[in-house]
């Protein structure tokens, strides 16, 4: 069976949108009006992994691009990157663990925990125009809560 995917955008809890910053980086900033068209559209695929009522495993690809968010060790630190893949083979139901995020639903907000590195989350800074990164703390200065907006295909 083919993997199921949905197109969506994400905004952090301060309503910052995610946009491309160079070929392999995302940044978060406030957008308004026509600038909203700059925001990244994700193809969220529902993949194999540990699932519970609050937690659903997903992969986050960039729509119509062969790029996926992935989590790898760089200089011994869990790091978020955009990784290029062969579009003939992706997305797939059994994604490699580095591509898998646990989409956790709490009080109408979403967190995206790395399956590869538990307790590390897709994060944004309070500051404007800063890179989206993998953070190891919740409830601190950095933002780990998001909302999801579905986008028609």
């Amino acid at each position: 069976a083919p993997v199921r995917s949905l197109n969506c955008t994400l905004r952090d809890s301060q309503q910052k949108s995610l946009v491309m910053s160079g070929p392999y980086e995302l940044k978060a900033l406030h957008l308004q009006g026509q600038d909203m068209e700059q925001q990244v559209v994700f193809s969220m695929s529902f993949v194999q992994g540990e699932e519970s009522n609050d937690k659903i495993p997903v992969a986050l690809g960039l729509k119509e691009k062969n790029l996926y968010l992935s989590c790898v060790l760089k200089d011994d630190k869990p790091t978020l990157q955009l990784e290029s893949v062969d579009p003939k083979n992706y997305p797939k139901k059994k994604m490699e663990k580095r591509f898998v995020f646990n989409k956790i639903e709490i009080n109408n907000k979403l967190e995206f925990e790395s399956a590869q590195f538990p307790n590390w989350y897709i994060s944004t800074s309070q500051a404007e125009n800063m890179p989206v990164f993998l953070g190891g703390t919740k409830g601190g200065q950095d933002i780990t809560d998001f909302t999801m907006q579905f986008v028609s295909s």
Partner: nanobody
Framework: EVQLLESGGGLVQPGGSLRLSCAAS????????MGWVRQAPGKGLEWVSS????????YYADSVKGRFTISRDDSKNTLYLQMNSLRAEDTAVYYC????????????????WGQGTLVTVSS
């Protein structure tokens, strides 16, 4: 043509048990995640349970966890739901769903569903 035919519903007393079946045809059953959703009188659809294509992963709504068991027999193209310790609030039409994928706590995607079987829990 995909067909899903549920059976096994009926009237049962609180605390009783029922086993629902769903006979599937028209697609390669073993390749697909399957599941059950239900609709209580006057309410919306509620996800009940899912089982992975291999049958090695099962998922349950909190409201039925520990009471219901989902299973599948790929040799018979059949999905099952064993319902124990039934309660009045389990009264609903139960639908079998093909390629059921849960996308959030209260949202699902599925390709096909059957006509349903009515379960009534009452004394």
């Amino acid at each position: 043509e995909v067909q899903l035919l549920e059976s096994g519903g009926g009237l049962v007393q609180p605390g009783g048990s029922l086993r629902l079946s769903c006979a599937a045809s028209g697609f390669t059953f073993e390749d697909y995640q399957m599941g059950w959703v239900r609709q209580a009188p006057g309410k919306g659809l509620e996800w009940v349970s899912s089982i992975s294509a291999m049958g090695n992963r099962t998922y349950y709504a909190d409201s039925v966890k520990g009471r219901f068991t989902i299973s599948r027999d790929d040799s018979k193209n059949t999905l099952y739901l064993q319902m124990n310790s039934l309660r009045a609030e389990d009264t609903a039409v139960y639908y079998c769903a093909e390629n059921l994928v849960r996308i959030s706590k209260k949202q699902w995607m599925f390709d096909y569903w059957g006509q349903g079987t009515l379960v009534t829990v009452s004394s």
